[in-house]
Amino acid sequence: APVRSLNCTLRDSQQKSLVMSGPYELKALHLQGQDMEQQVVFSMSFVQGEESNDKIPVALGLKEKNLYLSCVLKDDKPTLQLESVDPKNYPKKKMEKRFVFNKIEINNKLEFESAQFPNWYISTSQAENMPVFLGGTKGGQDITDFTMQFVSS
């Protein structure tokens, strides 16, 4: 079926917004007022994946850019990156595994688990202005809980 997508922004549980930091990196920081316009708008696509009754597979693209969050091994460590794709072929229902995240909703908060690397999550640091990364721990110092705000297309 044609892939179903929605536009949204994400904030971590400390209310930090996500913004571009250079061409291929996201960082998390507190924004207010007009600065909120800096936050990235994601095109969240609902794709095939190891769907369960608790987990919904999604791909996270940057709206109107040919960039997708993907998970790859770098120096033997699961790593989050922004990957450039051919806009003629993406998004698609059958995304490669590295692009797929399991969206998990717990107590009105969202977690995004890598399909490629189970138990690794999109994470932010407690500190301001630090890169968004793939973290292998939940419930520790790093933040793995997010809220989603819908954006009209």
């Epitope: 079926a1 044609p2 095939q48 994946g49 190891e50 769907e51 369960s52 009754n53 608790d54 987990k55 229902k93 059958k94 995304m95 490669e96 595994k97 797929v100 189970p118």
Partner: antibody
């Protein structure tokens, strides 16, 4: 060679729990999902649910409240438990291997067990 | 959930006949259509996946076509061993859903 074999009691009393085991060979349960499907006598096929390599499960809505699918990777076994059974649960129960081909055919089922008939009757 | 409407529910034909079975999905499923053959007392056997891809070892008289919502399964020249029940299955999204089945009988 990929093989799946269902086993369990052929007769279950109403209101009791139906328990079946699917023993697999030729593939690893940590790499491939396994579905359960049932077929009432003389009727069509109904997909029940599945367990993925990760251990996550997806249960079909009509049975969700009564269904538990679990597995033991080391024993190469998947189990199905269906509680509070009635005569309507009488069927041949099959387990089948998911294809798990990311970006190609993730949800299709390629190999099936031979099935086991479960009759619900007092 | 995606509904699959399969027709006909039964079909009488003779050896050598060309036989066609159709399946219609309630929404677009791209090419995520599978066709199974089931003989009495046996498990279903996968013949065709991804709408038209013949499984290894399956005779070339079996074929499938279609995409989106409308799909066709064809046996070009019926053989005695082909008399069985055939089911379509959509594998686009969970829950997986089957067609009602087509029983192919000897005329």
């Amino acid at each position: 060679e990929v093989q799946l074999q269902e086993s369990g009691p052929g007769l279950v009393k109403p209101s009791e729990t139906l328990s079946l085991t699917c023993t697999v060979s030729g593939f690893s349960l940590s790499d491939f999902g396994v579905s359960w499907i049932r077929q009432p006598p003389g009727k069509g096929l109904e997909w029940i649910g599945l367990i993925w390599g990760s251990g996550d499960t997806y249960y079909n809505s009509p049975l969700k409240s009564r269904l538990t699918i679990s597995k033991d990777n080391s024993k190469s076994q998947v189990s199905l438990k269906l509680s509070s059974v009635t005569a309507a649960d009488t069927a041949v129960y099959y387990c089948a291997k998911q294809r798990n081909l990311w970006g190609f055919d993730l949800y299709g089922m390629d190999y099936w067990g031979q099935g086991t008939l479960v009759t619900v009757s007092s | 959930d995606i509904q699959m409407t399969q027709s006909p529910s039964s079909l009488s034909a003779s050896v050598g006949d060309r036989v066609t079975i159709t399946c219609q999905a309630s929404q677009d499923i791209d090419d995520d259509m599978n066709w199974y053959q089931q003989k009495p007392g046996k498990a279903p056997k996968l013949l065709i996946s991804l709408a038209s891809t013949l499984r290894p070892g399956v005779p070339s008289r079996f074929s499938g076509s279609g995409s989106g919502t409308d799909f066709t399964f064809t046996i070009s020249s019926l053989q005695p061993e082909d008399f069985a029940t055939y089911y379509c299955l959509q594998s686009d999204s969970l829950p997986l859903t089957f067609g009602q089945g087509t029983k192919l009988e000897i005329k």
